[in-house]
């Protein structure tokens, strides 16, 4: 039943059939076998790399972006490519690895509060207590199609991580996407293995912060595969 599957008190990595395999009578998720949710559908390992076709960056993993594999190649054929590290060339934020952004064609670290006062196309909705709008929550308004505003704060609805303030990423929460904190050292993280290995993530965690990677906690090496705890650890 849904209540056993979607109990929201913890982050869920649901196994098939909710990940999309056939035949579960209690499931009404419309999914194809092997698809991971919510859009990070290609967490390959190096030894099992398969190019994943995409139409936009959001269809790729947090360490990837969507582009044509060859410069000047067929624009209709795009795949998820590995993100660009600091000081590599870029054309947009999504090309740069987590913790970086694209500035003047180069991936640079985002730990300076570079987003303050930046002109943005998207209106970020605030979860503040200034109850001034029809729906009862505060909302920043705009004088024109572009506006100056601070990036989305924790809990703000977002479309992509570049909508969120420094130190936050855009991740799934229930059936929506909100800005959540990038994980700090010692915090539990989600290690995505290869494509098709996990199901519907109702509560997605952010990635580990700068200089950290998601690894099995040392004292959990002896635990069974399924119960291994991953935490953000120094490289």
């Amino acid at each position: 039943t849904l209540n056993s599957v979607l109990n929201s008190n913890a982050i869920k990595n649901l196994p098939p059939p909710l990940g999309g395999a056939a035949g579960h009578p209690g499931s009404a998720v419309s999914a194809a076998p092997g698809i991971l949710y919510p859009g990070g559908n290609k967490y390959q390992t190096i030894d099992n790399y398969q190019p994943y076709p995409c139409a936009e960056d959001e269809e790729c993993g947090t360490d990837e972006y969507c582009a044509s594999p060859t410069r000047g190649g067929d624009a209709g054929v795009q795949i998820c490519l590995a993100c660009r590290k600091r000081r590599k060339r870029c054309m947009r934020h999504a090309m740069c690895c987590p913790g970086n952004y694209c500035k003047n064609g180069i991936c640079v670290s985002s730990d300076q509060n570079h987003f303050r006062g930046e002109i943005e196309e998207t209106i970020t909705e605030s979860f503040g207590n200034d109850h001034s709008t029809l729906d009862g929550y505060s909302r920043r308004t705009t004088l024109s199609s572009k506006m100056y505003h601070t990036k989305g704060q924790e809990g703000s609805v977002c479309l992509r991580s570049s909508d969120c303030a420094s130190g936050l990423c855009c991740a799934r929460h229930f059936w929506s996407k909100i800005c959540k904190p990038v994980l700090k050292e010692g915090q539990v993280c989600t290690k995505h293995r290869r494509k098709g290995s996990h199901g519907l993530e109702i509560f997605q965690r952010c990635y580990c912060g700068e200089g950290l990677s998601c690894r099995i906690q040392k004292d959990h090496h002896q635990a069974s595969n399924s119960s291994r705890l991953h935490t953000c650890q120094r490289h």
Partner: antibody
Amino acid sequence: QVQLVESGGGVVQPGRSLRLSCAASGFTFSGYGMHWVRKAPGKGLEWVAVISYDGNDKYYADSVKGRFTISRDNAKNTLYLQMNSLRAEDTAVYYCARELRVLWGQGTLVTVSS
Amino acid sequence: DIVMTQTPLSLSVTPGQPASISCKSGQSLLHSDGKTYLYWYLEKPGQPPQFLIYEVSNRFSRVPDRFSGSGSGTDFTLRISRVEAEDVGIYYCMQSIQLPWTFGQGTQVEIK
């Protein structure tokens, strides 16, 4: 202004189909999960279906599973509910609802009657 | 499904007097994000639900401050400090932490 406006309700015979629409405005529609909830005459509210922000994931109440289909068009800021094989017990006011920062529309009445 | 149980089912109140409605959930509505996904709303004939309180104790815009919510975990209360004639209707609690969203049976509030 921030609002949801449902349309498409009406009187329909049992076994027939109807498609409801919900037009969203004033907020980042494509970032929110959206739900349909209904209220039958003299009864309490009943949750019907949910669709994720990107349209990839959908869940339904057992009472409508296999008959109703929830969908969305983020380019048009619109949520849909395709209702097939309608029954008398589907008669209700149907509301679309935004999750997290809960917002409801004014509802549209569906009457299934021969 | 999470069962939401409201008491009392009806309440007759003198204008200016306080009123209190209880809602108990079959399991905790506290999420790991620290929020408790419990709402209160008012239903009047022919009108859509009018949401009063979100996340246990936060008032929606333009909701008079005579309405307040409290509680945690599985036990919640809606209080009206001084009932007014316009407050009549059916009050419901609702949880959205888990699918399907579920609702209390409703508490009919009327004026004496």
